[in-house]
């Protein structure tokens, strides 16, 4: 039985050219996290964090995606094209798969403030 919940940073905004942390957190379960996949709005892979093998960063993003903090992901040198949904998929044992969603808005404005908060989707 899957008892856990994924908490995410929810809807966040950040400046063009800046960076942002994408963060998910699995709570309310004792399940072991074996792998976390990070995907972009079009479901293309950004990164994988395997508990035993470490990180795999999709090659085209290696110059602007930094692993961490923790199981999260840091997106750097943001462009307007980075606006959209991001998904974290947690493979766990024995529970199975959990999925969280984050919406990132990249703003042109020089006064855009980075906002982030944890929420349960």
């Amino acid at each position: 039985m899957m008892t856990g919940t994924i908490e995410t940073t929810g809807n966040i905004s950040a400046k063009k050219g800046g960076s942002v942390i994408l963060q998910c957190h699995l709570s309310s379960t004792m399940a072991q996290v074996t792998q976390v996949n990070w995907e972009q709005h079009d479901h293309s892979l950004l990164a994988i964090r395997n508990a035993e093998l470490g990180w795999h960063i999709y090659p085209a993003f290696k110059d602007r995606v930094a692993p961490g903090p923790g199981l999260g992901l840091t997106l750097q040198s943001l462009t307007m094209n980075d606006t959209g949904e991001y998904f974290c998929t947690y493979h766990t044992y024995p529970d199975g798969t959990y999925r969280g969603r984050i919406f990132l808005e990249v703003l042109e404005s020089s006064v855009a403030e980075h906002s982030a908060r944890f929420q349960i989707p």
Epitope: T34, N50, E52, H56, P59, H91
Partner: antibody, heavy 119, light 107 residues
Framework: EVQLVQSGAEVKKPGASVKVSCKAS????????MHWVRQAPGQRLEWMGR????????KYNEKFKSRVTITVDKSASTAYMELSSLRSEDTAVYYC????????????WGQGTTVTVSS | DIQMTQSPSSLSASVGDRVTITCRVS??????LAWYQQKPGKSPKLLIY???TLAEGVPSRFSGSGSGTDFTLTISSLQPEDFATYYC?????????FGPGTKVDIK
Amino acid sequence: EVQLVQSGAEVKKPGASVKVSCKASGYTFTNYYMHWVRQAPGQRLEWMGRIDPDSGGSKYNEKFKSRVTITVDKSASTAYMELSSLRSEDTAVYYCAREGHYGFYSDYWGQGTTVTVSS
Amino acid sequence: DIQMTQSPSSLSASVGDRVTITCRVSENIYSYLAWYQQKPGKSPKLLIYNAKTLAEGVPSRFSGSGSGTDFTLTISSLQPEDFATYYCQHHYGNPLTFGPGTKVDIK
């Protein structure tokens, strides 16, 4: 065109070490992780470890952890695998293999380097 | 370690035959399975990753299916260049492990 060109065959005595090189070309070396896999005569493939050429961080198969070291020379776009305390059962073909786009599998392989351990 | 078994260990087939190879894994690996082809004296060649995604340049007669612990590689119409040994590999944990191989030879 992606190419992984490995160093030539080696004959070593038990207890010695061997260092195999893998020169990469046709892609950005630091963007793709590199794996090392070996195959003893008539046997299945056996994964030894992987390295991130950008950071130098590596992960090893526990079976080889005390004897294997995987390194890179970024300026030469070359990965290396050194295996120490050789024994006869280390006689095998050793392959470097580039990690694929979408995970921990390997999409391009070197031609292989035969290492023979014999007294 | 995750254990991999393949069946059959060898098979004889004719050009044009439909060939199916099975890979069984000791624990759930979701869809993190790759298939490779290896010819004598040559390096392995990637055919399929993520259980069913065809690698670049691989003919469409090759297909993969399955998830969890049971996976299948199918060659819809065997061609002369397909006579080789086929290996499955999980790409999910440390150590990455390979199946013992299935040798496909000419009947």
